[in-house]
């Protein structure tokens, strides 16, 4: 502990200028004081001033008022510092002396004489309030006040609690009157060394080094560090824990970048046609009558379906068509005949057969001719056999499809992929993805094109279940399981009913 007993001398009265022994001072009593502070004694005794002692210079002659003085010689109040826990009780002896000698250091002069003395014993609590008193004897009167205060940085009832305000990384606080710490705004903890993070900052996933901050731990993001960061490259997926990539509905693959539901996501089929998914990014459009093209985007003329029979000619109208019938035929589609076999209605060598007791007929056409009267040469392109926008061309009795770039096959039904040039080395499997081909590598190889030989084979331990194929070089775990139909999971360990058209890459 550490504190100061302060004694303020206010007025000393010795009107007759007398000493304690009854003699008078000549020319007057040049007065200084000796103060002795010690532990409480019921009966004050001589002996060491255990709490401290102090002397003053000459403060006046006979009777005088003592002015406050903050520094130098004759300081008032008098200071009696102590370096222990203040016990709350004390004994104080104040002696007034006359000196014939030096004003500044009368204590050292020979021939000093006692004028009077007072003794105070009692209790005194630490505090800023001065206790005022006055002591009289037959010849003199002394007015004074006193108190005990704690030294700088000491607090509490007995000045025993050391506290120094600080604002560094070992504490951010001020000191309360009792010596306890009062944290500065934004700080908490026993030593006020823990910052109070931004309100709502996630307790586990965020932290701070100064108040109102929220620094995210690896794998977390957002103002409050409550959003996980998905796996790098995760396209159509989310996470519940960091570095995860849980695919949104209709997406698959390690990075959820393989579209399993192209129809729903992109609606590629136009004009009311039906869209059917067929694996990653694959789909087919089934057109309504009157439309053609890969996406059924091409509208056919209303006459394109050749609705007029028996050689009738078709004329397009705004929302319909009109059949101009040849002689001997009538009806919306010229389907009704006024002719009989006697009129030789069958062309191109067709045979006439009478029907309805000769009131009508039917023609049996030779090869390569069709129509009610065998009037039409067979057009093998009528059924729109060419897929993906291919152009149909009649070649005598047969027809061929002229495919658009990127398609092949008899009906242009095959997509020529980036994988056609076999970019994957060492037997890697090629997958056409939006941004180009991706190789899944066999055991022992990795890299974009399976060109890197792996010295440590992550697949050697056989981590994939249920007959899945193991590949390395595609994931941070060093291996990837390509699941067979009916199984999912990072190791293909979970059975589930999945469409057989797309093998899951776990």
């Amino acid at each position: 502990g550490s504190g100061i007993f302060q004694l303020r001398l206010q007025e000393f009265v010795n009107q007759r200028g007398m000493l304690a022994n009854g003699q008078s001072c000549e020319p007057g009593c040049r007065t200084f004081f000796r103060i002795c502070l010690k532990h409480f004694q019921a009966t004050f005794s001589e002996g060491p001033c255990t709490f401290g002692n102090v002397s003053t210079p000459v403060l006046g002659t006979n009777s005088f008022v003592v002015r406050d003085k903050n520094s130098g010689s004759g300081r008032n109040p008098l200071q009696l510092p102590f370096n222990f826990t203040w016990p709350g009780t004390f004994s104080l002896n104040i002696q007034a002396w006359h000196t014939p000698g030096d004003d500044l250091r009368p204590e050292t002069s020979p021939g000093n004489s006692l004028i009077s003395q007072i003794i105070i014993q009692g209790s005194l609590a630490v505090g800023k309030i001065w206790r005022t008193d006055e002591q009289n004897d037959t010849l003199t009167r002394l007015s004074y006040s006193y108190r005990v205060i704690c030294s700088d940085n000491y607090y509490g009832e007995s000045c025993s609690r050391l506290c120094k305000k600080r604002d560094d990384h070992f504490g951010h606080y001020e000191c309360q009157p009792d010596g306890s710490l009062s944290c500065l705004p934004g700080w908490t903890g026993k030593y006020c060394d823990q910052p109070i993070c931004l309100s709502g900052c996630h307790e586990q996933n965020g932290y701070c080094s100064k108040p109102d901050e929220c620094i995210c731990r690896p794998g977390w993001q957002g103002r409050l560090c409550n959003e996980c960061i998905p796996h790098n490259g995760c396209r159509h997926g989310t996470c519940s824990i960091p570095w995860q990539c849980a695919c949104d509905e209709g997406w698959g693959g390690l990075f959820c970048d393989q579209d399993l539901n192209y129809c729903t996501h992109h609606s590629p089929c136009k004009n009311g046609s039906t869209c059917s998914n067929s694996g990653p990014k694959g789909y087919t459009c089934t057109c309504l009558p009157g439309y053609t093209g890969e996406h059924c985007e091409l509208g056919l003329s209303k006459c394109a379906s050749n609705p007029c029979r028996n050689g009738g000619s078709c004329k397009d109208q705004e929302n319909s068509y009109h059949c101009l019938c040849p002689p001997g035929y009538y009806g919306q589609h010229c389907e009704h005949s006024t002719l009989t076999c006697a009129d030789s209605p069958c062309f191109n060598g067709g045979s006439c057969r009478e029907r309805n007791q000769g009131s009508s007929y039917a023609c049996e056409c030779p090869p390569n001719f069709t129509g009610s009267n065998c009037e039409k040469k067979v057009d093998r392109c009528t059924s729109n056999p060419c897929a993906n926008g291919g152009q149909c061309q009649n070649r005598g009795p047969s027809r061929t499809c002229r495919c658009r770039p990127g398609f092949t096959g008899t009906h242009c039904e095959l997509h020529i992929s980036d994988c056609a040039r076999s970019p994957c080395a060492h037997g890697g499997t090629c997958h056409d993805l939006e941004n180009g081909p991706v190789c899944t590598c066999p055991a022992g190889f990795s890299g974009r094109r399976c060109e890197v030989r792996i010295t440590h084979d992550a697949c050697a331990s056989g981590p994939c279940f249920n007959g899945a194929t193991c590949y390395t070089g595609l994931s941070p775990n060093n291996f990837v399981c390509n699941c067979p139909y009916g199984f999912v999971g990072s190791r293909c360990e979970f059975p589930v009913g999945l469409p057989p058209s797309f093998p899951w890459v776990a």
Partner: antibody, heavy 121, light 106 residues
Framework: EVQLQESGPGLVKPSETLSLTCTVS??????????WGWIRQPPGKGLEWIGD???????YYNPSLKSRVTISVDTSKNQFSLKLSSVTAADTAVYYC?????????????WGQGTLVTVSS | SYELTQPPSVSVSPGQTASITCSGQ??????ASWYQQKPGQSPVLVIY???KRPSGIPERFSGSNSGDTATLTISGTQPMDEADYYC?????????FGYGTKVTVL
Amino acid sequence: EVQLQESGPGLVKPSETLSLTCTVSGGSISSSSYYWGWIRQPPGKGLEWIGDIYYTGSTYYNPSLKSRVTISVDTSKNQFSLKLSSVTAADTAVYYCAREGVPLGGGADKWGQGTLVTVSS
Amino acid sequence: SYELTQPPSVSVSPGQTASITCSGQRLGDKYASWYQQKPGQSPVLVIYEDSKRPSGIPERFSGSNSGDTATLTISGTQPMDEADYYCQAWDRDTGVFGYGTKVTVL
């Protein structure tokens, strides 16, 4: 009982980077009661505080060295490290790692045995 | 930058009291620590927060700090106390050591 052990090369060439690691055993570096510091002592001279770090990664550096010093922490390994770049012969010293206690007002109650690093070509 | 000044050396007879001072501007408003370092050894904390002793440090080591001066007192000095002594304080977020005092037990 907590012990600290410095490790790293004893010889570094001028203009290169000095790298030291302090491994803490017998206690967790993630304690909220301590900072982990580096102090150096050139031969025959006094102690110089370099800087310290908290387990969260908060760092404090001596302004006279700040431009060249990096202190980092790896809680998974219970280690913290010092990097001092562009060294000169004046950086030759015994380098100590130490534990500074928040309850001790910043006093360093545990020290490593020190490792002498000489900067010379 | 903040500086702490110590006398380069202090001599003391066995059994006597050695006082080592450490001066710095308004040092009394900061907490002072003291370290003992013997030749070829790491420093050892002997006083923290001006006057507190870590466990294992003998009672003959005591400290005080007020005004501009912190003092380490070794009462009843023993030959084993011969060592270099460093004061240390924190100036904001920077640790500052005194230049060190060599205590010789005569």
